[in-house]
């Protein structure tokens, strides 16, 4: 038969950061290829990554159509060299993925401090707003556009001469903090979605930026 000696995929795993979403699976193919299908709970199946020898498939284009929907994918296994034939009725072996809701489950990418500016005893720290592949009216949306006030940034800031980290929070991408005059400070930010309860609640910390380096500006 057309699907003899093919092995069903297993360990189907969603890898998603800032909505860039890839489905990964095993095993590495030996004399077989894969095709992926994706659908919403109520929608039709759409095929992607036709007859690929890869063990991953970028599904970003599909999930960004509605990031609040829940998606299911499945991976079909075919013999290597398989050509679709209209007469074939035998369904190839396949495995279903876990359900995936991008809005709830995509990981938050590492944020970046765009700039900081000191005016007297105040410092304005700006977090770079990352672009995503989510679109609205043919315009790409930023992370802030997608998550709105659900996305919080926590700023950690400390005197270069000390270890204790003060914190500030914002539901925009800007912080305005009080600092001691004549002191140099370092900054790091973390993205948080407080409504989440799992591992994807927080991003990794941004690279540390310190006053006296090129990102900063100081005015009396």
């Amino acid at each position: 038969s057309g699907t003899t000696n093919t092995v069903a995929a297993y360990n189907l795993t969603w890898k998603s950061t800032n909505f860039k979403t890839i489905l990964e699976w095993e095993p590495k193919p030996i004399n077989q290829v894969y095709t992926v299908q994706i659908s919403t709970k109520s929608g039709d199946w759409k095929s992607k990554c036709f007859y690929t020898a890869d063990t991953e498939c970028d599904l970003t284009d599909e999930i960004v159509k509605d990031v609040k929907q829940t998606y299911l994918a499945r991976v079909f296994s075919y013999p290597a060299g398989h050509v679709e034939s209209t007469g074939s009725t035998e369904e190839p072996p396949y495995e279903n993925s876990p359900e995936f809701t991008p809005y709830l489950e995509t990981n938050l990418g590492q944020p970046t401090i765009q700039s900081f500016e000191q005016v007297g005893t105040k410092v304005n720290v700006t977090v770079q707003d990352e672009w995503t592949l989510v679109r609205r009216n043919d315009t790409f949306l930023s992370l802030r556009d997608v998550f709105g006030k659900d996305l919080i940034y926590t700023l950690y800031y400390w005197k270069s001469s000390s270890s204790g980290k003060k914190t500030a929070k914002t539901n925009t991408n800007e912080f305005l903090i009080d600092v001691d005059k004549g002191e140099n400070y370092c900054f790091s930010v973390q993205a948080v979605i407080p409504s989440r309860r799992t591992a994807n609640r927080k991003s990794t910390d941004s690279p540390v930026e310190c006053m006296g380096h090129e990102k900063g500006e100081s005015r009396e």
Partner: antibody
Amino acid sequence: EVQLVESGGGLVQPGGSLRLSCAASGFTIAYYIIHWVRQAPGKGLEWVGYIDPSNGYTYYADSVKGRFTISADTSKNTAYLQMNSLRAEDTAVYYCARDDQSLSSPFDYWGQGTLVTVSS
Amino acid sequence: DIQMTQSPSSLSASVGDRVTITCRASQDVNTAVAWYQQKPGKAPKLLIYSASFLYSGVPSRFSGSRSGTDFTLTISSLQPEDFATYYCQQHYTTPPTFGQGTKVEIK
């Protein structure tokens, strides 16, 4: 069910040391911030310090800076308060509390507290 | 550090009374204020967060409001289980600071 359980309190002499534990269940401490708060007998609440277990960042109240150290072991889902050079004025019930890291960061869950008595 | 000045330090009231407790922040704290209830020998419990949001499971007779740097906790109709000490707390900046507490006693 979210729970925080403190342990390790007791009677200690001035100048002595004590390590308090805060064991969390029902959530993973690495995704939150953990604070220590104390309450002297008949007095109000005093914030002691915090740790973000995801990066190890800490900050302390001036009254304990240099004497107390907060740490966390994410594999044990437990935070710790190491108290050195204890003074009579450190006598209090010590609570750990979870900070949900939202914009207003309320302490949404608290432990039952553990009593530390510093006396000779 | 930001000071949270809470008043009154104690009050006597009867079941059914409307009770108001206020907290004044020494500088702007936006809405980053929470209110807690504490009973003797027990840990504090969160009542109100973000100045005016009722925490899950808290009876609707509790409410919070903000006017500039003044924050108010109101109990619309005091119940027997509400006799306790109440604390405000700001978490706008580190260190977070508490008010001195208000003990609500039975008249």
